[in-house]
C-alpha cells in the first residue's frame, strides 16, 4: 500500500515538545489483551524521515541479516529486498540463510505508481527491539522493482500489518503478525506511537531522530495522555473504521456521512497524508481555506504540491483551524472524537529553503479509494490495534507537536444515530481485492 | 485594463528610508485573486523579489531583506506601498511592482520600474 | 534553497532561426516554473507559467517543455522583436522568489 502520495512518511522527537503534557486521566476502559504498563525493551524502536517512512529493526535468516523494515498498516505482505538496488545499502541473502525455505512461487504487486515482484519463502524472523522471540514467518523476497524503494529512506523492505485478507497473492499467505501470535504466547494487539517532527529537519537531525515506538503484544501507558477510546475494526481486511462526522474549528461538514467512508476507511501507518474521498476533500479544503482567510495560498499548496514557507518560528499555526473526525464507538449511538492541529497535516519539508525558513505541503490530499489516516493523523495520537477484540484505540500521544494554546485531543463520548449506515458497502467482484495501488 | 504605476523619489541618501508608492488602475486591489509584490533589479543585474502583500494585509518578506522592508497597502487610494531603511548603495535598483496572478503564483503584470539611486 | 541556473549566458542567433534555452533548478520544482522576457528599459514580462502554459497575449512561437529539474524554453522562429533577456523563476517553494541568473539572446 506504498506509493503515490501513500510515500512512507517522516521521522521525529521522542519527548512533548515545549515540556507540554496532558494531565493523566483515569482509564475507563475496560481491560485490554496483553501486557499492560512497561513495555521499555519496545520504548523508541522506530526510526524515520520526513515523508520517508517508519522503520523497526528486524532480523532475518540464519545467521541473522539486520534490515530496516517500513511499518505498514495498509497492507499484509512481509516483503524485503533480496537483490542489489541502487537505493539499497544491505538486502536478504537468501543463499547465506541455512533456514531459509523456498515456496517456489511467485508474488506480484502492481501500485497506482510502480511495483515489487519477488519470490515467497519462508525464514526465521526476530525484532531486536521487540518481543524476545523467533518466529518462522512467510518473506516476499523482492527480486525486481519500480519505484517502490525511496532513496535515502534508509529501509530496505516492508512489514505489512494489516490481515489476510489482503494478502498476495492471495489469503493463503498468513502475514507475520499472525505467525506471531500463532507461534508465541504474545498478545494479538500492537500499537503504534509515530512521532512528527512538526519542523523541518537537516539530514543530521534526521538520521539521529527518533521516529517513535512500536509496542508488541499490548499498550504502554507511558506513550499517551488521558484516556484510550476505542472504534471497532468494521471488517477485517486494511484496518477499516467508521468516520460518522467530520468538522473544521468545530464547523460541521454537514455530508452524508457515508461519504466519509466512500469507499472505505483505513488506519494506514504507511501512507504520509490524511486523505479524503473528492467531495469531502473538496468540501474540507473549502472551510480550511475560509478559515484561515486572513492569509491566501497559492492553489498548489492545497494540492499538496507547493511548499509554503516562513521566517524560521513565525509559521502562524493560529490561522489555521482544527480538523475533527468522529469515529463510531464501541457503545450503540455512541462515537468520539480526535482533534489534529495544523502541526499535524502542515508536514515540514526539508532542504528546500534557506535555514532562515520554515517551509511546510499541506498533508492533506484527495483519494479515489476511500479515507486513509495516515501519518498525518496518527502522528498526533498513540494508535492502539487491538486485532483480538476487532477495535483499534486512540489517545492523545505524549510525543505529538502542538503550541501553548492548542493541543491535539481525544474526546468523548457523542450521542451519534445510526452510525451503521454511515459505512459503504462495497460490490463484491472477483477484482474488489485489487486495490492495491492508492494514488 | 489593469495598470500599475510606481511612483516616489529617485535619489536616496545612505541610511535613511526609501519609499515608493504602486498605484492600481483599471481594477481593484482588493481582489480576492491576487497578491501585490515588489521586486528590484540592480542595474544590469538579475530580479530580486521583495515581498508581496495582499489586500487583507497579510506579507510575505524576502527572507534577506526582512529586517528593513515594509510592505503595506491602503485599498481606499488603490495602492500599495513599500519601505525599505538603512539604505546602502546596493539597494540601488530599479523597482518593480507587480501583481500576483494565476492562483497567487505568478507575476501577470508588472509596473514599468522607477529607478531608485542611493547616494549621498 | 533551491537555485536555479540558466544556460547559455548569452545566445547568439539569427532571425528566424530557432532559439532553444534551459534553466535547471538544483532540486525538483515540479511544473512550477514560470518563463519572463524583457527587453532594454522595460518590465519583464509573463511569457510562460506552469513550465509549459503561454500567458495571455504571448504568440505560439514561444514554448515551454519540462518538469522536475529540467526546463526548456523554446522560441520557434526568432522575430526581431524576440532579441531580450529571457529569465525563468520557480514559484514551487512559495513565496515566489528565486529567478535564474538570465540568458540573453542577440542578434549574430
Known amino acids: 500500500t506504498h506509493l503515490g502520495i501513500r510515500l512512507p512518511l517522516r521521522s521525529g522527537l521522542a519527548g512533548p515538545p515545549l515540556g507540554l503534557r496532558l494531565p493523566r486521566e483515569t482509564d475507563e476502559e475496560s481491560e485490554e489483551p496483553g501486557r499492560r504498563g512497561s513495555f521499555v525493551e519496545m520504548v523508541d524502536n522506530l526510526r524515520g524521515k520526513s515523508g520517508q517512512g517508519y522503520y523497526v529493526e528486524m532480523t532475518v535468516g540464519s545467521p541473522p541479516q539486520t534490515l530496516n523494515i517500513l511499518v505498514d498498516t495498509g497492507s499484509s505482505n512481509f516483503a524485503v529486498g533480496a537483490a542489489p538496488h541502487p537505493f539499497l545499502h544491505r538486502y536478504y541473502q537468501r543463499q547465506l540463510s541455512s533456514t531459509y525455505r523456498d515456496l517456489r512461487k511467485g508474488v506480484y504487486v502492481p501500485y497506482t505508481q510502480g511495483k515489487w515482484e519477488g519470490e515467497l519463502g519462508t525464514d526465521l524472523v526476530s525484532i531486536p527491539h521487540g518481543p524476545n522471540v523467533t518466529v518462522r514467518a512467510n518473506i516476499a523476497a523482492i527480486t525486481e522493482s519500480d519505484k517502490f524503494f525511496i532513496n535515502g529512506s534508509n529501509w530496505e523492505g516492508i512489514l505489512g500489518l494489516a490481515y489476510a485478507e489482503i494478502a498476495r497473492p492471495d489469503d493463503s499467505l498468513e502475514p507475520f503478525f499472525d505467525s506471531l501470535v500463532k507461534q508465541t504466547h504474545i498478545p494479538n494487539i500492537f500499537s503504534l506511537q509515530l512521532c512528527g517532527a512538526g519542523f523541518p529537519l537537516n539530514q543530521t537531525e534526521a538520521l539521529a531522530s527518533v521516529g517513535g515506538s512500536m509496542i508488541i503484544g499490548g499498550i504502554d501507558h507511558s506513550l499517551y495522555t488521558g484516556r484510550l477510546w476505542y472504534t471497532p475494526i468494521r471488517r477485517e481486511w486494511y484496518y477499516e473504521v467508521i468516520i460518522v462526522r467530520v468538522e473544521i474549528n468545530g464547523q460541521d461538514l454537514k455530508m452524508d456521512c457515508k461519504e466519509y467512508n466512500y469507499d472505505k476507511s483505513i488506519v494506514d501507518s504507511g501512507t504520509t497524508n490524511l486523505r479524503l474521498p473528492k467531495k469531502v476533500f473538496e468540501a474540507a479544503v473549502k472551510s480550511i481555506k475560509a478559515a484561515s482567510s486572513t492569509e491566501k495560498f497559492p492553489d498548489g499548496f492545497w494540492l499538496g504540491e507547493q511548499l509554503v514557507c516562513w521566517q524560521a518560528g513565525t509559521t502562524p499555526w493560529n490561522i489555521f483551524p482544527v480538523i475533527s473526525l468522529y469515529l463510531m464507538g464501541e457503545v450503540t449511538n455512541q462515537s468520539f472524537r480526535i482533534t489534529i492541529l495544523p502541526q499535524q497535516y502542515l508536514r515540514p519539508v526539508e532542504d528546500v529553503a534557506t535555514s532562515q525558513d520554515d517551509c511546510y505541503k499541506f498533508a492533506v490530499s484527495q483519494s479515489s479509494t476511500g479515507t486513509v489516516m495516515g501519518a498525518v493523523i496518527m502522528e498526533g495520537f498513540y494508535v492502539v490495534f487491538d486485532r483480538a477484540r476487532k477495535r483499534i484505540g486512540f489517545a492523545v500521544s505524549a510525543c505529538h507537536v502542538h503550541d501553548e494554546f492548542r493541543t491535539a485531543a481525544v474526546e468523548g463520548p457523542f450521542v451519534t444515530a445510526d452510525m451503521e449506515d454511515c459505512g459503504y458497502n462495497i460490490p463484491q467482484t472477483d477484482e474488489s481485492t485489487l486495490m492495491t495501488g492508492r494514488a | 485594463q489593469l495598470q500599475l504605476q510606481e511612483s516616489g523619489p529617485g535619489l536616496v541618501k545612505p541610511s535613511e528610508t526609501l519609499s515608493l508608492t504602486c498605484t492600481v488602475s483599471?481594477?481593484?486591489?482588493?481582489?480576492?485573486?491576487?497578491?501585490w509584490g515588489w521586486i528590484r533589479q540592480p542595474p544590469g543585474k538579475g530580479l530580486e523579489w521583495i515581498g508581496q502583500?495582499?489586500?487583507?494585509?497579510?506579507?510575505f518578506y524576502n527572507p534577506s531583506l526582512k529586517s528593513r522592508v515594509t510592505i503595506s497597502v491602503d485599498t481606499s487610494k488603490n495602492q500599495f506601498s513599500l519601505k525599505l531603511s538603512s539604505v546602502t548603495a546596493a539597494d540601488t535598483a530599479v523597482y518593480y511592482c507587480?501583481?500576483?496572478?494565476?492562483?497567487?503564483?505568478?507575476?501577470?503584470?508588472w509596473g514599468r520600474g522607477t529607478l531608485v539611486t542611493v547616494s549621498s | 534553497e533551491i537555485v536555479l541556473t540558466q544556460s547559455p549566458a548569452t545566445l547568439s542567433l539569427s532571425p528566424g532561426e530557432r532559439a532553444t534555452l534551459s534553466c535547471r533548478a538544483s532540486q525538483s520544482v515540479s511544473s512550477y516554473l514560470a518563463w519572463f522576457q524583457q527587453k532594454p528599459g522595460q518590465a519583464p514580462r509573463l511569457l510562460i507559467y506552469d513550465a509549459s502554459n503561454r500567458a495571455t497575449g504571448i504568440p505560439a512561437r514561444f514554448s515551454g517543455s519540462g518538469s522536475g529539474t529540467d526546463f526548456t524554453l523554446t522560441i520557434s522562429s526568432l522575430e526581431p522583436e524576440d532579441f531580450a533577456v529571457y529569465y525563468c523563476?520557480?514559484?514551487?517553494?512559495?513565496?515566489?522568489?528565486?529567478f535564474g541568473g538570465g540568458t540573453k539572446v542577440e542578434i549574430k
Open positions: 523563476q520557480q514559484v514551487y517553494v512559495w513565496p515566489p522568489r528565486t
Open positions: 507587480a501583481r500576483l496572478g494565476h492562483g497567487y503564483s505568478y507575476f501577470d503584470l
Open positions: 502583500i495582499y489586500y487583507s494585509g497579510s506579507t
Open positions: 483599471g481594477g481593484s486591489i482588493s481582489s480576492s485573486s491576487y497578491y
